[in-house]
């Protein structure tokens, strides 16, 4: 029997009573000391939940009357008050009692975090830890193996484990993404130490693999055959590859390049988008010098961490046999441009030259020639250049012509070459007076005046200097009346050889000049250098005789 | 492994047009990247190469012969063909069909050869 | 067309000894164009070795290649009695041409 504190006269003993009983369950009694049987108090029960119980009025007796449910309700506190009914009075003062509810095993594990998602990297060994799962059991843990929980593995063999008392998931076996990506796992936990009688829980967990890059790139064929067309400009697509890659995203992305290629005449450029090959012309092919190629390709990874090059070993490589393609090429002539000489005035028909253009191709195809720039040549189907005039240098040094040969076989194909013709000199020109002397000599002239310096130009071209001679002719008697004296520096001098000349006896001199170049062979041409006496007045000035000469051919008369 | 197979008429009048076939067992002609070819080889002198054809129709002839050459394919049968056109006594030969390597235009596989004799 | 030039023309040895035949070619060619074959009487030609030093399947090591540019050469290190036949190289760079052959016989 229980005494509370205050020493008061209330005795019971400790209240405890088994949860979810569905028959009433009497608990004990409440009994006052005062209570001397003679059926004059009366008990009565105060308190939250107080409801849930009963109590016999006369003899205390405490039952619970509802089933009660230690998960929700553990504890009740009441209050206990004992009334004599013959004062109506309460005997003793209120007591706080308490009533234990007894755990049982009635609730099973529960999972509370679900759903539960876990990734792991494939390959990952054996003991890597994946996910904690934990399950809670209501039941009273301080009460026998209620809620003591293991845990097990029902479905997940043989890849992973899961410790019994911790709930932690481990891989137990290595897996392959490219084989399975995920697992649904199944966890099971059991109470009571998984001992009879056992209520359980189960969750499912759903473990992805995520992608380690433990796959190389592979090749889709061993072989490829690709061709190019000669005309193909270097930087040209000609094609592509292809390889496949067993992992996903940036495991995936590879770089194709070239492993052998003698003629370094291709190239391989990535398109990271399609993740393809892109074959390239590096250098342009030519079908005549060599039409078949061979070269070796390989492919790698972009990103390979050093503890995955294991994978990696020895890059995937493929063969490309490249073909070329013949295209019908152009004449080529073999000079870019022909420059020929022909000394001016031969006859018609000299050859000049001979240009020639072959077919770079396999057939080798004839040619036929035609030439535009000038009337003045023809060419025939050997590429000979001939005059179809006599060439004067004097009237064009130079002739700029085009020649184009065409095939016979293919008209289409038409190539040009420019023809530079250079006319040679030869001396074929006398040298004579440079310009057209209008000369005057004063009628009171003094001896060894200088009348007139005269020059003279040559329409040949000279290697040298061109050099003049001047000599006055000797058939010429009747001009004693001047003198020339040659200058040495291509001009000369003519000068008054008398004291005095009269306008209305002898107005005018007809001087005969003859002037030589220095050509071999020399020329020599006459030339005559007319001479009009001038009223000059007294100063001798023959400033105005032109004036005076135009007025005298006009009719007029000077003073 | 690639067997290859020549059959075709022995004896062929002049100027008349000289036809064999080539017959591919252990291996599809169809095959990406593989050329077949005729070769013939003159009694007691060395080899010339008459053309090649790809499975999709491309073919490519030596340019002496070029005028005078068909070379066919036929899928289906896994088979190719040659005719030359306008024979002489002079295109008498050992005639070999022949397909070239995984490496390189080298020629990888050869058919054991058949004997074609012009005369009238 | 690029023209090849085998030299010897007839090769006489005791089985044995080292064979080296030369093969030439009118102009440069890649070593990567070259290949090597070996024809029985009767029989068609057997591809020995391309590229121009690897070796075809089922070709023994006493068969080697090597070259570049216009001179190639084809060694059999020690001669066994059927290799006395004749050789042919062949390029395959420029279409495809074979030289003349060199017969290798018994001396």
């Known amino acids: 029997d229980y005494k509370d504190d205050d020493d008061k006269a209330w005795v019971w003993r400790p209240f405890v009573v088994l949860e979810e009983m569905d028959d009433i369950q009497c608990v004990g009694k409440l009994r006052s000391d005062l209570d001397n049987g003679n059926n004059s108090f009366q008990y009565k029960l105060l308190g939250i939940g107080a409801g849930s119980f009963s109590i016999n009025e006369r003899t205390g007796e405490i039952c619970a009357i509802q089933k009660l449910d230690r998960e929700e309700k553990s504890l009740y506190i009441l209050r206990a008050q004992v009334i004599d009914t013959t004062i109506g009075k309460a005997v003793e003062t209120e007591s706080e009692f308490v009533i234990r509810v007894l755990d049982i095993n009635d609730n099973e594990p529960k999972f509370l975090d679900e759903p539960y998602e876990a990734i792991v990297p494939e390959m990952s060994p054996e003991g890597t830890l994946v996910i904690q799962v934990t399950a809670s059991d209501a039941d009273d843990p301080s009460s026998g193996n209620n809620a003591r929980l293991l845990y097990s593995l029902l479905q997940g063999q043989p890849y992973f484990s899961v410790e019994p008392t911790t709930g932690v998931i481990r891989i137990s076996s290595k897996m392959d993404r490219e084989l399975q990506d995920e697992y649904w796992v199944i966890i099971q936990a059991k109470d009571m130490i998984g001992q009879p009688g056992a209520l359980s829980g189960t969750t499912s967990v759903l473990i992805k693999l995520s992608d380690v890059n433990d796959n190389k790139p592979i090749f889709k064929e061993s072989l490829y055959r690709l061709t190019v067309s000669e005309s193909a400009p270097t930087g040209t697509s000609i094609g592509t590859i292809m390889a496949y890659d067993n992992d996903i995203g940036e495991n995936a992305e590879m770089d194709y390049s070239i492993e052998e290629d003698d003629s370094q005449t291709f190239d391989i450029i990535t398109n990271h988008e399609t993740q393809e090959g892109i074959v390239i012309l590096k250098k342009k092919v030519d079908f005549e010098h060599q039409n078949h190629y061979g070269i070796r390709a390989k492919v790698k990874n972009h990103h390979v961490p050093e503890q995955l090059m294991k994978y990696h070993t020895e890059a995937s490589t493929t063969f490309i046999k490249i073909q070329v393609e013949d295209v019908d090429e152009p004449p080529v002539f073999l000079l870019p441009y022909y420059i020929l000489e022909i000394p001016e005035g031969k006859p018609y028909g000299t050859i000049v030259g001979t240009v020639s253009a072959t077919d770079p191709d396999r057939r080798q195809s004839p040619m036929r020639y035609y030439l535009t720039g000038s009337k003045m040549f023809d060419i025939n189907d050997n590429g000979t250049i001939i005059t179809t005039n006599m060439l004067d240098r004097e009237v064009s040094a130079w002739y700029n012509l085009t020649v184009t040969a065409t095939e016979t076989y293919n008209v289409q194909q038409i190539s040009s070459a420019h023809v530079y013709v250079q006319v040679f000199n030869i001396n074929d020109n006398a040298p004579e007076f440079s310009q057209f002397y209008e000369t005057y000599v004063c009628e009171n002239a003094e001896s060894g005046e200088i009348v007139q310096i005269i020059s003279a130009i040559d329409r040949d071209e000279s290697i040298e200097d061109h050099h003049f001679y001047f000599n006055h002719s000797l058939e010429d008697t009747n001009n004693s009346s001047f003198m020339l004296t040659d200058n040495q520096d291509n001009t000369a001098v003519i000068l008054s050889n008398r004291t005095g000349f009269n306008l209305k006896e002898e107005p005018v001199f007809y001087m005969i000049i003859l002037i030589a170049d220095n050509g071999i062979p020399s020329l020599t041409s006459t030339n005559t250098l007319t001479i009009q006496v001038c009223d000059c007045g007294d100063s001798r000035n023959t400033e105005t005789c032109a004036n005076k000469g135009l007025l005298f051919i006009m009719g007029f008369r000077t003073e | 492994q690639v067997q290859l197979q020549e059959s075709g008429p022995g004896l062929v009048k002049p100027s008349q047009t000289l036809s064999l076939t080539c017959t591919v067992s252990?291996?599809?002609?169809?095959?990406?990247?593989?050329?077949w070819s005729w070769i013939r080889q003159h009694p007691g002198k060395g080899l010339e190469w008459i053309g090649y054809i790809y499975y999709t129709g491309s073919a490519y002839y030596n340019p002496s012969l070029k005028s005078r050459v068909t070379i066919s394919v036929d899928t289906s049968k896994n088979q190719f063909s040659l005719k030359l056109s306008s024979v002489t006594a002079a295109d008498t030969a050992v005639y070999y069909c022949?397909?070239?390597?995984?490496?390189?235009?080298?020629?990888?596989?050869w058919g054991q050869g058949t004997l074609v004799t012009v005369s009238s | 067309e690029i023209v090849l030039t085998q030299s010897p023309g007839t090769l006489s040895l005791s089985p044995g000894e080292r064979a080296t035949l030369s093969c030439r070619a009118s102009?440069?060619?890649?070593?990567?164009?070259l290949a090597w074959y070996q024809q029985k009487p009767g029989q068609a030609p057997r591809l020995l070795i391309y590229g121009p030093s690897s070796r075809a399947t089922g070709i023994p090591d006493r068969f080697s290649g090597s070259g570049s540019g216009t001179d190639f050469t084809l060694t059999i290190s020690r001669l066994e009695p059927e290799d006395f036949t004749v050789y042919y190289c062949?390029?395959?760079?420029?279409?495809?041409?074979f030289g003349p052959g060199t017969k290798v016989d018994i001396k």
């Open positions: 062949q390029q395959y760079g420029s279409s495809f041409t």
């Open positions: 022949a397909r070239d390597g995984s490496s390189g235009w080298y020629f990888q596989y």
């Open positions: 252990g291996g599809s002609i169809s095959s990406s990247g593989y050329y």
């Open positions: 102009r440069n060619i890649s070593s990567s164009y």
